[in-house]
């Protein structure tokens, strides 16, 4: 196309980004192929893992406040994982967005929605735990699954609200070499007379606000909640941290490690408007740290399983149930009473009031993972939702 590549007004950093060309260097091409492979694998893993977590926590576990938090975190991660295949396609076609402006806006919005939702939900989890320890009587009376769902809905609404500017200012921009960028274009709406000033102020506002709201404030809430809980538990003489504490700690650590670099580069990018010398650094680093932020959604389900033995047990049973229901022979449907009795007993056990992370009867760590992978034929199968519902009414 021999049209002007940039008919709409663009910020200087975008104009210069449009000059950058795809590489013909062979070693860089190999990195590209590896990146496509890695992102493709992450897409698949993220979708499967978060889907399984949603299924296990939502359908195979007794609903508690804790499972509600995990359910919503997994939902946020599933959304992000669902957008990852499109990012993989962007990489596969040579770093060019071929899916149109509307989908560019939607895809980017999902990334930012996940960013805000994760930060807000982790803050809520920490505050919830803090209230349990600092205000136990109040928590006893007000901590219900319904209340947790309501809080989550409010947090999702806030996350959506914070994502709106990223939807509005996302655009497709043609590069000089013919590739298409899906990137910020802060001059899309009311550019004003001073283009440079508008570019600078808006980019800084976006970068600083997302750093504060989606990273610094959540981490501050998490840290202060943890400090308050630690102080209170010290007075009570508690020593070892509970399993749920370890789960939260792992998820928070992953959140900080995966999103921290992204926010650093996002702030550098905002500075690069006024300081062109930062541009090459930003252009080099931003794709990597964005991928790292995406991978947070793939890491979380692994952390739930690794830090939570009961989750692993439920997961194993659920997978066996799915396999059994698929592989079951017609003649076995009206099978012997002994098998029916065995199922009922397992149902009663599954319906017992279990939190997300109860004490396991199984080995921990790598041995547990290995055991799960190899499978334990002796373990009793999990019942379907109908049987569970019926048995729970009698219990």
């Amino acid at each position: 196309m021999s049209a002007n590549a940039t008919l709409k007004p663009l910020c200087p950093i975008l104009e210069q980004m449009s000059r950058l060309q795809s590489h013909s260097n062979t070693s860089i091409r190999y990195i590209d192929h590896a990146a496509v492979l890695l992102h493709g694998l992450a897409s698949l893993l993220g979708l499967v893992e978060n889907g399984v977590i949603l299924f296990v926590v939502g359908c195979r576990m007794r609903q508690t406040v804790v499972t509600t938090w995990v359910l919503h975190l997994a939902l946020s991660d599933l959304l992000a994982s669902a957008s990852l295949p499109f990012f993989t396609y962007f990489l596969a076609v040579g770093h060019s967005w071929e899916l149109g402006t509307t989908f560019c806006k939607l895809h980017s919005s999902i990334f930012f929605l996940n960013m805000f939702a994760s930060g807000f939900l982790l803050s809520a989890i920490s505050l919830d735990r803090c209230l349990q320890v600092v205000r136990p009587v109040w928590a006893q009376n007000h901590r219900t699954v319904a209340a947790a769902h309501k809080v989550c809905l409010v947090l999702w609404a806030l996350a959506v609200l914070n994502t709106v500017p990223y939807f509005v200012f996302r655009d497709t921009i043609s590069r000089l070499d013919g590739r298409i960028m899906c990137y910020y274009n802060v001059l899309l709406l009311n550019p004003g007379p001073d283009r440079d000033a508008t570019c600078n102020s808006r980019q800084v506002a976006l970068a600083v606000s997302k750093f504060l709201l989606a990273f610094l404030v959540p981490l501050a809430i998490i840290a202060s909640s943890h400090a308050a809980v630690s102080l209170r538990l010290q007075h009570r003489g508690r020593r070892r941290p509970g399993r749920f504490v370890r789960l939260v700690a792992a998820v928070v650590a992953a959140f900080a490690l995966c999103w921290g670099p992204y926010h650093v580069f996002s702030l550098l990018e905002a500075r690069a408007h006024a300081n062109p010398g930062l541009r090459p650094l930003v252009w080099r680093g931003l794709p990597f740290v964005t991928s790292l932020a995406f991978f947070n959604s793939v890491a979380n389900p692994v952390l739930y399983v690794l830090t939570c033995p009961d989750m692993l047990r439920k997961l194993r049973r659920s997978l066996r149930t799915v396999l059994e229901s698929v592989l079951v022979d017609d003649s076995e449907l009206g099978g012997a009473g002994s098998s029916r009795r065995r199922r009922t007993s397992s149902t009663a056990r599954s319906a017992s009031p279990l939190a997300l992370c109860s004490r396991p009867e199984e080995p921990r760590g790598p041995a547990r993972l290995l055991g799960w992978l190899l499978g334990s034929c002796a373990a009793s199968p999990q019942t379907g939702p109908l049987n569970r519902a019926l048995s729970s009414t009698s219990s």
Epitope: M1, S2, A3, N4, A5, P12, E15, Q16, R19, L20, Q21, S22, H23, S24, I28, S174, R175, L176, D177, G178, D196, A274, N275, P276, G277, L278, R279, P280, W283, R284
Partner: antibody, heavy 122, light 107 residues
């Protein structure tokens, strides 16, 4: 070696158009950008715009939008600049120059053509 | 647009003399800056890019430096072929802009 060979001097009438050519040799034409620059007699240099020969995408200085049209023919490794509705103010020497970029950085105008003098006179 | 203010506009110097030309950018350009030489026959050659990197084939007597928004071109010992017009160029932001030029003449 890298060379940019421009077309010869042109004497044109006001209101008409002129096309200046810039033939590249000694490098892969489609992997570099071609910039166009104007120099009025006894004056400084002014950037007109840039074209990517591989895609045909271009970017113009606001001042030259509607005046200059940049094109490229990859088969002959030649870049063109068409100047329309010529006035005496368009009388100048026009240069083409090569610029490069990588995935992460760019540089400007490492090799220049010898210039094409365009005189607009009735 | 970024303004490039070049000084002096003309300079007379003798062979073997050391001379410096300066260019000031109206905005931060972070070294996206070049020095160009235009010979009396009109041909243009880039001498320096990225504020201080010498182009291949350019004699070592030419050097570029930067101090904040001020950029300098120094010729340590003038030779006869150095008498020409010199222009600075910023390529940080569109539209790329040039300095007004410095005419270097033999004293």
């Amino acid at each position: 070696q890298v060379q940019l060979q421009q077309s010869g001097t042109g004497l044109v009438r006001p209101g008409t158009s002129v096309r200046v050519s810039c033939k590249a040799s000694g490098y892969a034409f489609i992997t570099y950008l071609i910039e166009w620059i104007k120099q009025r007699p006894g004056q400084g240099l002014e950037w007109i715009g840039v074209i990517h020969p591989g895609s045909g995408n271009s970017h113009y200085n606001e001042k030259f939008k509607g005046k200059a049209t940049l094109t490229a023919d990859t088969s002959s490794s030649t870049a063109y600049m068409q100047l329309s509705s010529l006035t005496s103010g368009d009388s100048a020497v026009y240069f083409c120059a090569r610029s490069g970029s990588s995935s992460f950085d760019y540089y400007a105008m490492d090799f220049w053509g010898q210039g094409t003098s365009v005189t607009v006179s009735s | 647009d970024i303004q490039m203010t070049q000084s002096p506009s003309s300079l007379s110097a003798s062979l073997g003399e050391r001379v410096s030309l300066t260019c000031r950018a109206s905005q931060e350009i972070s070294g996206y800056f070049s020095w160009l030489q235009q010979k009396p026959d009109g041909t243009i050659k880039r001498l320096i890019y990225a504020a201080s990197t010498l182009d291949s084939g350019v004699p070592k007597r030419f050097s570029g430096s930067r101090s904040g928004s001020d950029y300098s071109l120094t010729i340590s010992s003038l030779e006869s072929e150095d008498f020409a017009d010199y222009y600075c160029l910023q390529y940080a932001n569109y539209p790329y802009t040039f300095g007004g030029g410095t005419k270097l003449e033999i004293k």
